[in-house]
């Protein structure tokens, strides 16, 4: 029960991760004009990974795309990358966490399959996370780079008669979300594997049981459960939810109209 | 049609305080920001502050910070510019005029003459 | 604040001459965000308040007749009349749209020569 909880909780926080890390991608607000100690701006400038906006107090908003690939900064360009590759990824960890679920019955899929499954997806939203919270610092890193520089520039050349209103940028709202995002993806994906963990020796023990089935020892009871006896910490009952999932060793000791895990 | 109509003028004593009021019909009053402009006598244009009638939220020229006032009424459409602690210098036409593209103004009232004098 | 210095104060021309009016910028009024100016003009007659005729420095206001056109970039712009007309004799404004608070240049007196 708590194998298949780590297990649902781990899918859930990196479907939410995921989720964010997209919205992210997509959000213009990455970086958002330094207002310092100006609160209220005649002229509003943010921008994205994919377009740079302007809002002007007089509400008007407009977007533009950066329609050029070759003149791109090389870091926007990694940053994009390393936010499509964590999109892929999750997406992918996703579609695999699905089938690996416990709690879903796909035609007769051993608990060693879904191990294996579970582990893959959740190394899957490890890797996603890590690429969200690299892309985010990457993206981050050279903001704080180029606000110093352009704090530099302001007191810089002042001499003269016109003075050029350098604008500077902060941490736009996308940064964090994109932070929360890839940490909550980074951290489902460790409950995947721990869950992977969890599912691997109950998988070993049924495997036991079935092995060693072909002896007197195991007692078919009524309403769809089986008891084992003398087989170490295996000797609780266990009710049947999988309608047809079993082993090699099950289906070649019990050619039975029930069936059992 | 959209109009501005403004209050009529006004004759104050110096230190007393002056409210003008700004109707406005023919488009969603609470859509566009409202601003405050002054003209004294062979002056400049001169941007007092602005009022956002959806929010309430202001902004003042530091200059008449501590002295202006702008408040708005949805229900009436109407703003509102009180200047307070008046000095012979504020003798001017005060105009409301709407905000709109390119930060310009491209609706005035007819404005309204505020004279100071002992 | 920025400071908007119009130049001539006053300018007499021949109806259907060309005027031109120049405001310069203490500050550049390029936005890098749209690689727009935000500098507007406005035209003012007697008794009457302002009315809008360019903004972005060269966008002209529907119902603007198109003898009116704005230019220029950073800090320096102009006005042009390209061919007087008798109801043109104004007043005539240019404003900084960029930056709180909103200044305007002292203005420049239009006359028919």
């Known amino acids: 029960m708590a194998v298949t909880a780590c297990q649902g909780l781990g899918f859930v926080v990196s479907l939410i991760g995921i989720a964010g890390i997209i919205a992210a991608t997509c959000m213009d607000q990455w970086s958002t004009q330094d207002l310092y100690n100006n609160p209220v701006t005649a002229v509003f400038n943010y921008q994205g990974l994919w377009r740079s906006c302007v809002r002007e107090s007089s509400g008007f908003t407009e977007c533009r795309g950066y329609f050029t690939l070759l003149g791109l900064p090389a870091m926007l360009q990694a940053v994009r990358a390393l936010m499509i590759v964590g999109i892929v990824l999750g997406a992918i960890g996703l579609l695999v966490s699905i089938f690996a679920l416990k709690c879903i019955r796909i035609g007769s899929m051993e608990d060693s399959a879904k191990a294996n499954m579970t582990l893959t997806s959740g190394i899957m939203f490890i890797v996603s996370g890590l690429c969200a919270i690299a892309g985010v610092s990457v993206f981050a890193n050279m903001l704080v780079t180029n606000f110093w520089m352009s704090t530099a520039n302001m007191y810089t050349g002042m001499g003269g008669m016109v003075q050029t209103v350098q604008t500077r940028y902060t941490f736009g709202a996308a940064l964090f979300v994109g932070w929360v995002a890839g940490g909550l993806t980074l951290i489902g994906g460790v409950m995947m594997c721990i869950a992977c963990r969890g599912l691997a020796p109950e998988e070993t023990n049924y495997k036991a049981v079935s092995y060693h089935a072909s002896g007197h020892s195991v007692a078919y009871k009524p309403g769809g459960f089986k008891a084992s006896t003398g087989f170490g910490s295996n000797t609780k009952n266990k009710k049947i939810y999988d309608g047809g999932a079993r082993t090699e060793d099950e289906v070649q000791s019990y050619p039975s109209k029930h069936d059992y895990v | 049609e959209v109009q501005l109509v403004q209050s009529g003028a006004e004759v104050k004593k110096p230190g007393a305080s002056v409210k003008v009021s700004c109707k406005a019909s023919?488009?969603?009053?609470?859509?566009?920001?409202m601003h405050w402009v002054r003209q004294a006598p062979g002056q400049r244009l001169e941007w007092m502050g602005m009022i956002h009638p959806n929010s309430g939220s202001t902004n003042y020229n530091e200059k008449f910070k501590g002295r202006v006032t702008i408040t708005r009424d949805t229900s009436a459409s109407t703003a509102y510019m009180e200047l307070s602690s008046l000095r012979s210098e504020d003798t001017a036409v005060y105009y409301c005029?709407?905000?709109?593209?390119?930060?310009?103004?491209?609706?005035w009232g007819q404005g309204t003459t505020v004279t100071v004098s002992s | 604040d920025i400071v908007l210095t119009q130049s001539p104060d006053s300018l007499a021309v021949s109806l259907g001459e060309r005027a031109t009016i120049n405001c310069k910028s203490s500050q550049s009024l390029l936005n890098s965000g749209n690689q727009k100016n935000y500098l507007t003009w406005y035209q003012q007659k007697p008794g009457q308040p302002p009315k809008l005729l360019i903004y972005w420095a060269s966008t002209r206001e529907s119902g603007v007749p198109d003898r009116f056109s704005g230019s220029g970039s950073g800090t320096d712009f102009t006005l042009t009349i390209s061919s007087l007309q008798a109801e043109d004799v104004a007043v005539y404004y240019c404003?900084?749209?960029?930056?709180?608070?909103?200044?305007f240049g002292q203005g420049t007196k239009l006359e028919i020569k």
């Open positions: 404003q900084n749209a960029y930056t709180y608070p909103f200044t």
């Open positions: 023919g488009y969603t009053f609470t859509s566009y920001w």
């Open positions: 005029a709407r905000l709109k593209t390119g930060n310009s103004f491209d609706y």
